[in-house]
């Protein structure tokens, strides 16, 4: 996208002792319009069950243009990934609403010890070609021990990270069949350049 | 994750010369000072019970100027609504802390089926003059089945949305009597232009 | 707000019909590069038990440079505090993941009343030299009544506040021994100037 509006340079008088510019120097700073920063808000869609590797949480796929969902300014979505088009600091967030049914988990004991509870987990993961292993940026994990009822609850995550051009972001969950995909306001994923 | 045979991830060819913008290009952009962007952080006040329509969650009202609360740069609060003064992408957030008391919900069964649990829900809603139906932007909903005790817990929501000048934002809850209005840091609502 | 670094002016050609500046007008605004704004993302480390005053929640200490953690542009971390280097509006966030083990809390009653449940609490606190009392900016508090199991769950907080140069931010928790310090993506604390 070409920006439509004007070249800015900023001129200022440096403070005494200022680290990066001598006094009175004309400084060209990387100013830019907020409106042209990469941004995306993705919303839930019905998930197609996919095979995934043992010990690897499956990734959710998302709606990127209908309803509340959008991508803009070179932030693209493809194949479960948000693609980072520009290096910088991004705020990244996601909420996943889970729903399911659990048995009375306190009644199942192993050798007198409390049982390991069922749990739900959301991970926002970064894949980068400058590091061989996916990096878990954010994790929300919660035991679920809901005493025999139908239960539902959200996990929300959000934080700021330094990302590089070409990085890919995805949202992984512990059990894709428990994700509430019924409403775009319940389960979502987004990021924006600060 | 393995994709079903024949299913492709979206592939596109970058423009020759590269993906974003030619270097050295003169860029025109609507720059503006960050300090003059519309922003608000509202905090909880004691709610006066109001009649609301069946099947419609009541809206909370808020403190907008005392303590931690503020509105600035033409972002106004009136009659439970935040008024959006300028079109753009906004980050919108809210936390509502609920408290109450539940019976042992696993003991109440209907025809042998697990009962539908009590629940708590927060919705951030957008009202637009040009559109007859309010739009639910964000929803956090949670079953509450707390085994006979006094319980309390927060629901947090936050995401980015493209809003238009004149849009109105409100926070709706499933049961206004369960909202903890005792402290400004427990229940709040805010938005800022990115 | 006083700028620490110089007065910027930006000159641009206004769009036809633009509301706020006639064509060719020189506009003076506190513009600044987004990349030089104070920002920090801190991640959990193993906590050393410290003595704290009765009725005062202990503060967590943090990793500020390894892994995902960073501080930049004069935002410094020292001795459990984030130090605010410049007045302005900041988005502040934290997640704390707790884990523990509770007894069946519904079975313990006092004089026939439901028991006061165990709870977990996170508070983001501001300390200002010019004000004797710390200010609680954000609180997430949750009853824990998990029916005899090992449990774990996060509390997430985030909101925008107007801070002054010299303010200090910390994260306090109700019980430091319940904090999950095992992974940098589970428990974190951050802030950035808007």
């Amino acid at each position: 996208q070409l920006r439509a509006q004007g070249e800015a340079c900023v001129q200022f008088q440096a403070l005494k002792g200022q680290e990066f510019a001598p006094s009175h120097q004309q400084v060209y700073a990387p100013l830019r319009a907020d409106g042209d920063k990469p941004r995306a808000h993705l919303t839930v869609v019905r998930q197609t069950p996919t095979q995934h590797f043992k010990n690897q949480f499956p990734a959710l796929h998302w709606e990127h243009e209908l309803g509340l969902a959008f991508t803009k300014n070179r932030m693209n979505y493809t194949n479960k990934f948000l693609l980072i088009p520009e290096s910088g600091d991004y705020f990244i967030y996601s909420q996943v609403t889970f729903r399911g049914m659990t048995s009375e988990c306190s009644e199942i004991r192993q050798a007198g010890r409390p049982n390991k509870p069922d749990s739900i987990t959301v991970v926002i993961t970064k894949v980068t070609d400058s590091y061989p292993e996916p990096t878990q940026l954010l994790m929300g994990t919660k035991s679920v021990c809901e005493v025999g009822s139908n239960w539902f609850q959200p996990i929300y995550l959000g934080a700021m990270f330094s990302l590089q051009e070409g990085d890919k972001l995805m949202v992984n969950v512990s059990d894709i069949s428990l994700v509430d995909y019924t409403k775009e306001d319940k389960t979502f994923f987004g990021a924006f350049l600060l | 994750q393995l994709r079903a045979q024949g299913e492709a991830c979206v592939q596109f060819q970058a423009l020759k010369g590269q993906e974003f913008a030619p270097s050295h290009q003169q860029v025109y952009a609507p720059l503006r000072a960050d300090g003059d962007k519309p922003r608000a952080h509202l905090t909880v006040v004691r709610q006066t019970p109001t009649q609301h329509f069946k099947n419609q969650f009541p809206a909370l009202h808020w403190e907008h100027e005392l303590g931690l609360a503020f509105t600035k740069n033409r972002m106004n609060y009136t009659n439970k609504f935040l008024l959006i003064p300028e079109s753009g992408d906004y980050f919108i957030y809210s936390q509502v802390t609920f408290r109450g008391m539940t019976s042992e919900c696993s003991e109440i069964r209907q025809a042998g089926r697990p009962n539908k649990p009590d629940s708590i829900t927060v919705v951030i809603t957008k009202v637009t003059d040009s559109y007859p139906e309010p739009t639910q932007l964000l929803m956090g909903t949670k079953s509450v089945c707390e085994v006979g005790s006094n319980w309390f817990q927060p629901i947090y929501l936050g995401a980015m949305f493209s809003l238009q000048e004149g849009d109105k934002l409100m926070v709706n809850v499933s049961d206004i009597s369960l909202v903890d209005y005792t402290k400004e840091d427990k229940t709040f609502f805010g938005a800022f232009l990115l | 707000q006083l700028r620490a670094q110089g007065e910027a002016c930006v000159q641009f050609q206004a769009l036809k019909g633009q509301e706020f500046a006639p064509s060719h007008q020189q506009v003076y605004a506190p513009l600044r590069a987004d990349g030089d704004k104070p920002r920090a993302h801190l991640t959990v480390v193993r906590q050393t038990p410290t003595q704290h005053f009765k009725n005062q929640f202990p503060a967590l200490h943090w990793e500020h440079e390894l892994g995902l953690a960073f501080t930049k542009n004069r935002m410094n971390y020292t001795n459990k505090f984030l130090l605010i280097p410049e007045s302005g509006d900041y988005f502040i966030y934290s997640q704390v993941t707790f884990r523990g083990m509770t007894s069946e809390c519904s079975e313990i009653r006092q004089a026939g009343r439901p028991n006061k449940p165990d709870s977990i609490t996170v508070v983001i606190t501001k300390v200002t030299d010019s004000y004797p009392e710390p200010t609680q900016l954000l609180m997430g508090t949750k009853s824990v009544c998990e029916v005899g199991s090992n449990w774990f769950q996060p509390i997430y907080l985030g909101a925008m506040f107007s801070l002054q140069e010299g303010d200090k931010l910390m994260v306090n928790v109700s019980d430091i021994s319940l904090v999950d310090y095992t992974k940098e993506d589970k428990t974190f604390f951050g802030a950035f100037l808007l």
Epitope: S130, K168 | Q1 | -
Partner: antibody, heavy 116, light 106 residues
Framework: QVQLVQSGAEVKKPGASVKVSCKAS????????MHWVKQRPGQGLEWIGR????????KYDPKFQVRATITTDTSTSTAYLELSSLRSEDTAVYYC?????????WGQGTTVTVSS | EIVLTQSPGTLSASPGERATMSCRAS?????MYWYQQKPGQAPRPWIY???NLASGVPDRFSGSGSGTDYTLTISRVEPEDFAVYYC?????????FGGGTKLEIK
């Protein structure tokens, strides 16, 4: 089992083109990045470039930018390296490799010989 | 581009000895990666992100360093360790390899 299987050896004349393939199995190539690396006989390793199969975005070492083209066919989980206007100094073993997911995996290599 | 210089070009060692090889970058990099290559075989990932051993790599190997100076160390060389070791940086585009250090039997 996670592996990369490359196409067989090629003998080409100067000025011709060659297209080497690298078929992935045991993982989704869109979850990673695919790289190509050159090794001339008795020499060290040279990085040619990489592709993000999810988007098609590529990056190259400038010295390979003009004559190398990296593509993928995600429906068959295959990455390709095409070299045009072949010269004698293109005689080498070409390896594909993935990054962005452990363990890092390399193909067995494809020998390309350019000879008149 | 970032140039990686490996030294020595050839390192002679006897089984049981300690062996150390160096990789120096022309400018600072975030991480260093090391590969082992034996004649007629593809390179094998050996150490990733400066100090993490790839799957199956014996713990007599270790990696260290930061900024521009990185080191691969073998605490006690075994016969199967004789090979060429390449360092690689992934911090800047293009990715670059060092020229290699050949570990040979003394």
């Amino acid at each position: 089992q996670v592996q990369l299987v490359q196409s067989g050896a090629e003998v080409k004349k100067p000025g011709a083109s060659v297209k080497v393939s690298c078929k992935a199995s045991g993982f989704d190539i869109c979850d990673t990045y695919m790289h190509w690396v050159k090794q001339r006989p008795g020499q060290g390793l040279e990085w040619i470039g990489r592709i993000d199969p999810a988007s098609g975005h590529t990056k190259y070492d400038p010295k390979f930018q003009v004559r190398a083209t990296i593509t993928t066919d995600t429906s068959t989980s295959t990455a390709y390296l095409e070299l045009s206007s072949l010269r004698s100094e293109d005689t080498a073993v070409y390896y594909c490799a993935r990054s962005g997911g452990l363990p890092d995996v390399w193909g067995q290599g494809t020998t390309v010989t350019v000879s008149s | 581009e970032i140039v990686l210089t490996q030294s020595p070009g050839t390192l002679s060692a006897s089984p049981g000895e300690r062996a150390t090889m160096s990789c120096r970058a022309s400018s600072s990099v975030s991480y260093m990666y090391w590969y082992q290559q034996k004649p007629g075989q593809a390179p094998r990932p050996w150490i990733y992100a400066t100090s993490n051993l790839a799957s199956g790599v014996p713990d007599r190997f270790s990696g260290s360093g930061s900024g521009t100076d990185y080191t691969l160390t073998i605490s006690r060389v075994e016969p199967e360790d004789f090979a060429v070791y390449y360092c690689q940086q992934w911090s800047g585009n293009p990715r670059t390899f060092g020229g290699g250090t050949k570990l040979e039997i003394k």
